[in-house]
Interface confidence: medium
């Protein structure tokens, strides 16, 4: 079980460090999406675990950005990032058979809403109980 | 430009308690991006890390060192400080505060103060 | 704890490549951090993580970690790289941080 969740860790190190850098290999973005946006996680232990994606980054070195897949809704009152830019992608993560391109990377600035819990307590959780 | 610097006395004698802070300017303490950390460097010898402590106030410490130390943070101050109970001259060091950054893959101090050289002596 | 191991003292030529090394369990789930220490100053760091190099630190210095070995590399050493590196990782509880006891590195 060990080497499981090592593997499992360098795998999803790599799907977050090249997040959104292919448009035609999105299955591993999609996979771990979803991961986030079921557990309601983010990261593998930590959020912060995204900043340091190349593509995710905002132009000020405190301006983070993070997948749609991190927002926690109920937590978030601006209906205009909510209408526009979080429910258009979080709808997406109800229907993975459609194929996400790489515009539809969904990056808008992070902190407050999103959720900051990782994701790596509850997967190995999971891992343990299948 | 995030800076951070150390102050406290220069001399301590042995059993006493030694109290040092770290004055943060350019970043929020209040960040649950960051950890933030104290350092010390015995004269001529190499880093030990002594401990850490995040904007929610956990805190974690050095478990080779005894458990001596302990790390607040008074965020409303910007500052965040280090005790040292019952010093011994094995304290003699140079004290350094440091921020950390978050991430599950490596762990790093991006920012350090000057450092403050601590004495103990009678 | 976990404990990270450095060689005390390496040594290279101007000019020439050198590899520190950095060994220890907790580096099979961690990487390193790079930190170089000229004397009476603070560390600062010059490598951390897969291949991150902070701003303003020359493109000579490089990382890489195979199994329990994380190694920081100077590719054509400058008489201004003479200092003490320490390597620095999380240890293998995740909670605890722990600094190798720090390479001397002398240009001749």
């Known amino acids: 079980r060990a080497q499981l969740e090592r593997s499992l860790r360098d795998v999803v190190e790599k799907t977050i460090q090249k997040y959104g850098t292919n448009p035609e290999e999105t299955a591993a973005e999609e996979s771990w999406d979803y991961v986030q946006f079921q557990l309601r996680c983010c990261g593998w232990h930590y959020p912060q675990d995204w900043f340091q994606v190349l593509i995710l980054r905002g132009n000020g070195s405190e301006a983070h950005r993070v997948p749609c897949s991190c927002y926690n809704l109920s937590a978030t009152n601006d209906s205009t990032i909510l209408d526009k830019v979080i429910l258009p992608q979080l709808s997406r993560l109800g229907h993975l058979a459609r194929s996400r391109h790489s515009a539809d990377i969904c990056a808008v600035p992070a902190e407050s809403h999103i959720y900051r819990e990782g994701c790596a307590q509850g997967l190995q959780k999971w891992l343990h109980n299948n | 430009q995030v800076q951070l610097q150390e102050s406290g006395p220069g001399l301590v004698k042995p059993s006493e308690t030694l109290s040092l802070s770290c004055t943060v300017s350019g970043g929020s303490l209040n960040s649950y991006n960051y950890y933030w950390g104290w350092v010390r460097q015995p004269p001529g010898k190499g880093l030990e890390w002594i401990g850490t402590i995040y904007s929610s106030g956990s805190a974690y410490y050095n478990p080779s060192l005894k458990s001596r130390f302990t790390i607040s943070v008074a965020t409303s101050k910007n500052q965040f400080s280090l005790r040292l109970s019952s010093v011994t001259a094995a304290d003699t060091a140079v004290y350094y505060c440091?921020?950390?950054?978050?991430?599950?893959?490596?762990?790093?101090?991006?920012?350090w103060g000057q450092g403050t050289l601590v004495t103990v002596s009678s | 704890s976990s404990e990270l191991t450095q060689d005390p003292a390496v040594s290279v030529a101007l000019g020439q490549t050198v590899r520190i090394t950095c060994q220890g369990d907790?580096?099979?789930?961690?990487?390193a951090s790079w930190y170089q220490q000229k004397p009476g100053q603070a560390p600062v760091l010059v490598f951390y993580g897969k291949d991150n190099r902070p701003s303003g630190i020359p493109d000579r210095f490089s990382g890489s970690t195979s199994g329990n070995t994380a190694s920081l590399t100077i590719t054509g050493a400058q008489a201004q790289d003479e200092a003490d590196y320490y390597c620095n990782s999380r240890d293998s509880s995740g909670d605890h941080l722990v600094f190798g006891g720090g390479t001397k590195l002398t240009v001749l």
């Open positions: 907790s580096l099979r789930n961690y990487y």
């Open positions: 440091a921020r950390g950054y978050r991430n599950s893959w490596y762990a790093l101090f991006e920012y």
